[in-house]
């Protein structure tokens, strides 16, 4: 049905609310007003995410759900807009918030870092890997002594608390380590931390932090990385690192350090091969080290280098890196 | 050789309560999260809940949550579906499956037979 | 409405190659999800045919294939057996739902006589 031309009232949303469905994970919910005259027309509401960091987005569904970190409190406003005649008709604003939970904020945990490693997995006889997330803490300056802290992560829809916990000379937890994860290594969720504590001297404050995959995921090294030196021909190869990612997904960078002369060079590239013209009157060491490509992933963390190949004069065969 | 064998179906009123249980053998059980996928005759695959390799962390399809509980004994090999306040609409045959993630998108590399649950007045 | 779609039915003769379609949406396949392939002989458990997009378990034949583009995935079967006559599942990850597994409804394949 068309508009009438004359000024339309936009009536806010009614019953918002904010729930927390998960970790560091809420739902917004509301309503549209039961007093709204144009029931026909195509209402939409804009969302806006006022702590603990800034955003709006529109939406034409009255739910919403969003990944945030909650320590500091959440708070949003929604309201009811109408696009006519290239202007913007909009309600005035219906807010609501999340305190931030209680605690001083010097009891909670500090320096919060995480990291995620595939390992190769003796279980699975299809998916021959898995991935394990160890993540490492700072104790509050004004945590009590009797402090004692507690890690669980979420991925996706899973949630699992640290069952190996490494400790400080006070007995108190600053390390967590699951062998196992429920997180996919080629996903694109956020991977949501959360490290709350205990004392009976004091309410000891939660810390939750967001991680994206890509710039937490320690790459393994490249595997079985072998030179040979045929005249003034330097040949090195290698095999991809133990990855959830397939061959066509890394991008890798060789390291060739002349022992006699300290010349370094370092090349990159896409294939598992490389061959460089030298001086075979040298001893060099070749180091390879490999990162996801952008084709397969934003990009992210390097590997370590692989262990050095000695390859050149005195050696009388070339040698294999297991 | 992985063998998954359901449990504990049968035929019961609207309402009712029934308790299915999934013996596995052949593989290390403990390391494993199991889950329950269910069908309803002549339909599709519906999965229904899962659990993690210790037992502590569960997941539930919208259509049983509050109603369905899974659980698991790591010592007695078995995994367990207490479903409550049963519908008509949860009458299906009931697999019990492993949930391998390793990575990646969960799939289920192992079914058992299915046990038939039948809710009816 | 989240989910996966399927056809209802496909035919083909013995020996034909016949193709599945799996269509998802932005919360799933789109987002570069993996994606699985069931196969249910009438009266049996489902048995996992394809991982991964496309990844065959040890003791499935090569004549089954998986492939993926956009938010679609399709099951491939060349040289089409009696044998193959059963439904066929996919499967991957919906973001927008709980507990996030998602299957299609099913595809009943028969192979014509």
């Known amino acids: 049905d068309l508009l009438p031309d004359d000024k339309i009232s936009l009536l806010p949303p009614v019953n918002f609310t904010i729930k927390v469905t998960g970790l560091a994970q809420v739902l917004l919910r509301w309503e549209p007003n039961p007093d709204q005259e144009q029931r026909n027309v195509n209402l939409e509401y804009q969302v806006k995410i006022n702590a603990p960091k800034e955003d709006d987005y529109e939406t034409r569904i009255t739910e919403s759900k969003c990944v945030t970190i909650l320590h500091k409190g959440f708070s949003a406003s929604v309201r009811t807009i109408l696009q006519k005649d290239h202007s913007l008709l909009a309600s005035s604003w219906a807010s609501a918030e999340l305190h931030a939970p209680p605690g001083s904020p010097g009891t909670s945990v500090v320096n919060l870092t995480c990291t995620t490693n595939t390992t190769a997995d003796n279980y699975s006889y299809l998916r021959p890997y898995q991935v394990s997330l160890h993540c490492t803490w700072l104790v509050g300056t004004d945590a009590p002594e009797d402090t004692q802290y507690f890690l669980y992560y979420r991925y996706g829809s899973w949630t699992e608390e640290c069952q190996e916990y490494s400790k400080d000379s006070m007995g108190r937890n600053i390390a967590c380590w699951f062998p196992r994860t429920f997180i996919h290594s080629r996903g694109r969720d956020w991977l949501a931390v959360l490290v709350n504590g205990s004392s009976k001297h004091s309410a000891i404050k939660p810390f939750d932090q967001l991680f994206a995959l890509h710039a937490i995921d320690q790459i393994n090294p490249p595997l079985n990385v072998t030179a040979e030196i045929k005249g003034t021909r330097l040949s090195i190869q290698w095999e991809k690192p133990v990855s959830a990612f397939p061959i066509h997904c890394f991008d890798y960078e060789v390291k060739i350090h002349n022992a006699r002369n300290g010349y370094l060079q370092i090349e990159k590239m896409m294939t598992n091969a490389f061959i460089s013209i030298i001086d075979d009157l040298s001893k060099y060491d070749v180091q390879v080290r490999a990162a996801v490509s952008s084709m397969c992933r934003e990009a992210g963390l390097w590997s370590e280098w692989s262990q050095p190949i000695y390859v050149g004069k005195d050696e009388h065969k070339p040698l294999r890196q297991w | 050789q992985v063998t998954l064998k359901e449990s504990g179906g049968g035929l019961v009123q609207p309402g009712g309560s029934l308790r299915l249980s999934c013996a596995a053998s052949?593989?290390?059980?403990?390391?494993?999260?199991m889950s329950w996928v269910r069908q309803a005759p002549g339909k599709g695959l519906e999965w229904v809940s899962a659990?993690?390799?210790?037992?502590?962390?569960?997941n539930y399809a919208d259509s049983v949550k509050g109603r369905f509980t899974i659980s698991r004994d790591n010592a007695k090999n078995t995994l367990y579906l207490q479903m409550n306040s049963l519908r008509a609409e949860d009458t299906a045959v009931y697999y019990c499956?492993?949930?391998?993630?390793?990575?990646?998108?969960?799939?289920?590399?192992?079914w058992g037979q299915g046990t038939t649950v039948t809710v009816s007045s | 409405q989240a989910g996966l779609t399927q056809p209802p039915s496909v035919s083909a003769a013995p020996g034909q190659r016949v193709t599945i379609s799996c269509s998802g949406s932005?919360?799933?396949?789109?987002?570069?999800?993996?994606v699985h392939w069931y196969q249910q002989v009438p009266g049996t458990a489902p048995k996992l045919l394809i991982f991964?997009?496309?990844n065959r378990p040890s003791g499935v034949p090569d004549r089954f294939s998986g492939s993926k583009s956009g938010t679609s995935a399709s099951l491939a079967i060349t040289g089409l057996q009696a044998e193959d006559e059963a439904d066929y599942y996919c499967?991957?990850?919906?973001?927008?739902?709980?507990?996030?597994?998602?299957f299609g409804g099913g595809t009943k394949l028969t192979v014509l006589r």
């Open positions: 991964d997009d496309n």
């Open positions: 659990i993690n390799s210790g037992g502590k962390s569960t």
């Open positions: 499956a492993d949930y391998a993630t390793n990575y990646g998108v969960p799939y289920f590399g192992s």
């Open positions: 052949g593989f290390t059980f403990s390391n494993y999260a």
């Open positions: 932005r919360s799933n396949i789109g987002s570069g999800y993996d």
């Open positions: 499967q991957s990850y919906d973001s927008s739902l709980s507990g996030h597994v998602v």
